[in-house]
């Protein structure tokens, strides 16, 4: 069967530019190695935000310079994206790939619309 991936429709980043959401997948197979990728869709262009491969039961490891962090629990991944600004508002898509053992499966969520509002600068005080 095709793999289903679920994620929230909308998330609001906090005042520090941090947004978190859960990406949940229904695994058709017994995967031991999973790859999670966050994609950003703006207009019709899709770009990769970050990606991590993890062993089931272990933590996700993103690259040191990644703006993403995450934790996994069963078929659920808790993703956090930081350093967001108003211009980063957009649709963030969770892609899950069951890499090992074969067969390979891929699932793509419908996307989470992340809204980012830049904080107002503090007024000067005399």
């Amino acid at each position: 069967k095709a793999m289903h991936v679920a994620q929230p429709a909308v998330v609001l980043a906090n005042s520090r530019g941090i947004a978190s959401f859960v990406c949940e997948y229904a695994s058709p197979g017994k995967a031991t190695e999973v790859r999670v990728t966050v994609l950003r869709q703006a207009d019709s262009q899709v770009t990769e935000v970050c990606a991590a491969t993890y062993m089931m039961g272990n933590e996700l490891t993103f690259l040191d310079d990644s703006i993403c962090t995450g934790t996994s629990s069963g078929n659920q991944v808790n993703l956090t994206i930081q350093g967001l600004r108003a211009m980063d508002t957009g649709l963030y898509i969770c892609k899950v790939e069951l890499m090992y053992p074969p067969p390979y499966y891929m699932g793509i969520g419908n996307g989470t619309q992340i809204y980012v509002i830049d904080p107002e600068p503090c007024p000067d005080s005399d």
């Epitope: 095709a2 190695e33 990769e48």
Partner: antibody, heavy 118, light 107 residues
């Protein structure tokens, strides 16, 4: 310009070997999974093999398993297919194809012809 | 292995007419289905992915629909350059599989 260019095809006898290459340009090759797809004369498309961006995960069609080996060299922006124990039914145009971020094969090379005949 | 069956095998139409191509999967592929166009002597070109999203640079006369096991590619007004072979492909699981193709020829 995003481009894939295959080479290495030719005429080989049954049981022989051949190594195909695919040179990538115009995109960050090391970020994408890659595939080989073949097309026998007058026939449809058949997926042959896939390799992940870092070569950690490799998949083969049952028809080539144990005979073909896919590999890549990210430093050289190149994809390879080592074909051993070739059979007449391996005669086809071989295409390399990039896996797009959303899953389909979004960029294809022009193909290289492999003929297995005595 | 997921088997994709395309119909009809050949479609004979005139420029300006509407083409409707079908692709049926042996089991659900959700929306992980793409459509490709191939002209003689050329490589396939991605037209549609995600069952209904046009790839970059594809004119809006091409549209895709469907989910699960039944999919359709529609070309609203055939242009001379649209006469070609069209393949569907599922990319949700390995082995990646293609349909046998539908040839759209000039009537």
């Amino acid at each position: 310009e995003v481009q894939l260019v295959e080479s290495g095809g030719g005429l080989v006898k049954p049981g022989g070997s051949l190594r195909l290459s695919c040179a990538a340009s115009g995109f960050t090759f090391s970020s994408y999974s890659m595939n080989w797809v073949r097309q026998a004369p007058g026939k449809g498309l058949e997926w042959v093999s896939s390799i992940s961006s870092s070569s950690s995960y490799i998949y083969y069609a049952d028809s080539v398993k144990g005979r073909f080996t896919i590999s890549r060299d990210n430093a050289k922006n190149s994809l390879y297919l080592q074909m051993n124990s070739l059979r007449a039914e391996d005669t086809a145009v071989y295409y390399c194809a990039r896996v797009g971020l959303m899953g389909p094969f979004d960029i294809w090379g022009q193909g290289t012809m492999v003929t297995v005949s005595s | 292995e997921i088997v994709l069956t395309q119909s009809p095998g050949t479609l004979s139409l005139s420029p300006g007419e509407r083409a409707t191509l079908s692709c049926r999967a042996s089991q659900s592929v959700s929306r992980y289905l793409g459509w490709y166009q191939q002209k003689p002597g050329q490589a396939p070109r991605l037209l549609i992915y995600g069952a209904s999203t046009r790839a970059t640079g594809i004119p809006d006369r091409f549209s895709g629909s469907g989910s699960g096991t039944d999919f359709t590619l529609t070309i609203t007004r055939l242009e001379p350059e649209d006469f070609a072979v069209y393949y569907c492909q599922q990319y949700g699981s390995s082995p990646w599989t293609f349909g046998q193709g539908t040839k759209v020829e000039i009537k």
